[in-house]
Interface confidence: low
């Protein structure tokens, strides 16, 4: 009540919305044929939908996405020396989210 | 460079810092002995350390944490009717982060 303070505050639902997440840039995204390189930066921020919906039959999903190309450094080791090259990785940002009904397929009888 | 703009922007490292994440409140946290209830809200926001460090030998870890008790509703089904009870769940928020050396134990020879 007003004027009283409980030690434990009421838990507030994490609503379905975009939040900043960390995306690991895997080497596979840049070159599947060669393992002899590093990627810089190793991770970037992306916007992703997360949170809960009102019941278990609906899930928080992206309703609008945007692809964002970014340049990364591909650091190849050539004759024991680092050679710095460039590569483009396309990130997926979620722009809007909604609670969407999850249609679970009926088991085949 | 300053004053220049390319179609693909340089990727910016997701630095090691606290970000808002969604924490699913599992029923185990409230009652391990009984499965016949629901929890509301099903998820809450917490602050967690995430991001990358400058090399693979260091990891982004919490350097300061705070426990935060929150009240949730435990909705028990008693004789087909919902009974609302209260329960306390303790959440862990990360207040500060640092890039910490990962000590990998040497293999026993």
């Amino acid at each position: 009540s007003l004027g009283s303070l409980a030690a434990a505050e009421p838990a507030v639902i994490a609503e379905c919305k975009t939040r900043t997440e960390v995306f690991q840039i895997s080497r596979n995204l840049i070159d599947r044929t060669n393992a002899n390189f590093l990627v810089w930066p190793p991770c970037v921020e992306v916007q992703r939908c997360s949170g809960c919906c009102n019941n278990r039959n609906v899930q928080c999903r992206a309703s609008q996405v945007q692809m964002r190309p970014v340049q990364v450094r591909k650091i190849e080791i050539v004759r024991k020396k680092p050679v710095f090259k460039k590569a483009t990785v396309t990130l997926e940002d979620h722009l809007a989210c909604k609670c969407e009904t999850v249609v679970t397929p009926r088991p085949v009888t | 460079s300053l004053g220049s703009l390319a179609a693909a922007e340089p990727a910016v490292i997701a630095e090691c810092k606290t970000r808002t994440e969604v924490f699913q409140i599992s029923r185990n946290l409230i009652d391990r002995t009984n499965a016949n209830f629901l929890v509301w809200p099903p998820c809450v926001e917490v602050q967690r350390c995430s991001g990358c460090c400058n090399n693979r030998n260091v990891q982004c870890r919490a350097s300061q944490v705070q426990m935060r008790p929150v009240q949730v509703r435990k909705i028990e089904i008693v004789r087909k009717k919902p009974v609302f009870k209260k329960a306390t769940v303790t959440l862990e928020d990360h207040l500060a982060c640092k890039c910490e050396t990962v000590v990998t134990p040497r293999p026993v020879t």
Epitope: W40, P41, Q71, V72, R73, P82, V83, F84, K85, K86 | S1, L2, G3, S4, A6, P10, A11, V12, I13, N54
Partner: antibody, heavy 120, light 107 residues
């Protein structure tokens, strides 16, 4: 207005050392990669070294590797080049330059340069 | 290492002329090519980055084109202040390398 001002050049004997400084102003120094580029008298431009915004990544031309060290102090908005075991062929005007972000690798803004003369 | 070859090494032209300078890379560098102008006793100045993007504050008479190994810097109508030495530079991989320069002189 972006300004880069180099200092520390001068006459030095072969085998000697010199430390160049570059004072930056007019932009967020700590957000930009920085480089040193040199130009021998009546010659073309030669890239020397580059350092990342935070100072954690450095790389060098083969001609200076093991002898020169690039560093920075973001609190002081300053870039440095420590030059050891100097040779006659290191004689040049040394420019500091802003090199953009992770993937730019160009030289957007330049200082006026400082002359290093290696001679006995 | 990627070698950058500029041609011609020098040229004479008059005010108002259209001038083209070429730069060739020893291997494909996509569009990671930059152009600089340097006047005697002065620091170089960035003109064009990413082969064709005009750096802020640079007059529109300067333009860049090309991709892969062959690139061109064009000055559509040469002005008195354009007499200088021009350098290309690849930013595809380290070591970063410059062309030998092209000196544009008054005819």
């Amino acid at each position: 207005e972006v300004q880069l001002v180099e200092s520390g050049g001068g006459l030095v004997q072969p085998g000697g050392s010199l430390r160049l400084s570059c004072a930056a102003s007019g932009f967020t120094f700590s957000s930009y990669w920085m480089s040193w580029v040199r130009q021998a008298p009546e010659k073309g431009l030669e890239w020397v070294s580059t350092i990342s915004d935070g100072g954690g990544l450095t790389y060098y031309a083969d001609s200076v590797k093991g002898r020169f060290t690039i560093s920075r102090d973001n609190a002081k908005n300053s870039l440095y080049l420590q030059m050891n075991s100097l040779r006659a062929e290191d004689t040049a005007v040394y420019y500091c330059a802003e090199s953009g972000g992770y993937t730019d690798w160009l030289f957007g803004y330049w200082g006026q340069g400082t002359l290093v003369t290696v001679s006995s | 290492d990627i070698q950058m070859t500029q041609s011609p090494s020098s040229l004479s032209a008059s005010v108002g002329d259209r001038v083209a300078i070429t730069c060739r890379a020893s291997q494909s560098i996509s569009n990671y090519l930059n152009w600089y102008q340097q006047k005697p006793g002065k620091a170089p100045k960035l003109l064009i980055y990413a082969a064709s993007s005009l750096q802020s504050g640079v007059p529109s008479r300067f333009s860049g084109s090309g991709s892969g190994t062959d690139f061109t810097l064009t000055i559509s109508s040469l002005q008195p202040e354009d007499f200088a030495t021009y350098y290309c530079q690849q930013s595809y991989s380290t070591p970063l390398t410059f062309g030998g320069g092209t000196k544009v002189e008054i005819k």
